[in-house]
Interface confidence: low
């Protein structure tokens, strides 16, 4: 596990789990018929969803200097999405198919976040918006958007861990 003060997480383990997350996130992507996405630009990316941005220290130099900034950002995002996947948006009607990868995705988000959580140290988690869609079609639409956003997030996280495993592992 990562601990405060700059020691590293299990980069290789994180890399493997983040690659699994990428696969699960793509396989969980639902097909939703009532969205017309001609071109989904940055303007449609929420302020509320955690993003990995330039100032987060996830670039090679930032990871070398102090990986904790980047890891904290990734941790926030993992917890954010883990909460969303465990919410009524995904547990409510219409029910997910029994073989849906969302359950595995949910568990893997939690697993990776635990690898990153410093022992004996609490990282602030980002509050998730209060979402209570009343209609099944609203839930379907939200699932689509959340999974799309999650795919982008875990893709960046996987690149971070791949770099860490290749260059920062002891």
């Amino acid at each position: 596990r990562a601990v405060p003060g700059g020691s590293s997480p299990a980069w290789t383990q994180c890399q493997q789990l983040s690659q699994k997350l990428c696969t699960l996130a793509w396989s969980a992507h639902p097909l939703v018929g009532h969205m017309d996405l001609r071109e989904e630009g940055d303007e449609e990316t929420t302020n509320d969803v955690p993003h990995i941005q330039c100032g987060d220290g996830c670039d090679p130099q930032g990871l070398r200097d102090n990986s904790q900034f980047c890891l904290q950002r990734i941790h926030q995002g993992l917890i954010f999405y883990e909460k969303l996947l465990g919410s009524d948006i995904f547990t409510g009607e219409p029910s997910l198919l029994p073989d849906s990868p969302v359950g595995q995705l949910h568990a893997s988000l939690l697993g990776l976040s635990q690898l990153l959580q410093p022992e004996g140290h609490h990282w602030e988690t980002q509050q998730i918006p209060s979402l209570s869609p009343s209609q099944p079609w609203q839930r379907l639409l939200l699932r689509f958007k959340i999974l799309r956003s999650l795919q982008a997030f875990v893709a960046v996280a996987a690149r971070v861990f791949a770099h860490g495993a290749a260059t920062l592992s002891p």
């Epitope: 303007e43 990316t45 609203q138 939200l142």
Partner: nanobody, 128 residues
Framework: EVQLVESGGGLVQAGGSLRLSCAAS????????MGWFRQAPGKEREFVAR????????YYADSVKGRFTISRDNAKNTVYLQMNSLKPEDTAVYYC?????????????????????WGQGTQVTVSS
Amino acid sequence: EVQLVESGGGLVQAGGSLRLSCAASGRTLSSYSMGWFRQAPGKEREFVARISPSGSAIYYADSVKGRFTISRDNAKNTVYLQMNSLKPEDTAVYYCAKDPSPYYRGSAYLLSGSYDSWGQGTQVTVSS
């Protein structure tokens, strides 16, 4: 504060078309996502369609997909809802609304409470 004024409603036969307009005064709409909602008698206000600031991303309610088209002309500070193949169940008061954020925010655009400015509405009646 922005003022929104809808127009273009009326009485139309089933299968007909109407084009609603939502004109804004007070400030430019170009930085904001805009939505159309409707409220039938005795029912809750429901989401119809939404368009992002540049018009690059559009969302529709399942019930209107393929029949309604939302668009915007930022130069004219106006948002439109083209309604084709109208059905009696489309009868409602139609409202346009401004999302206070230009960003997609979780489920915010689906929920009427997330919009901060509303027009007075325009009545659409579809007879069979």
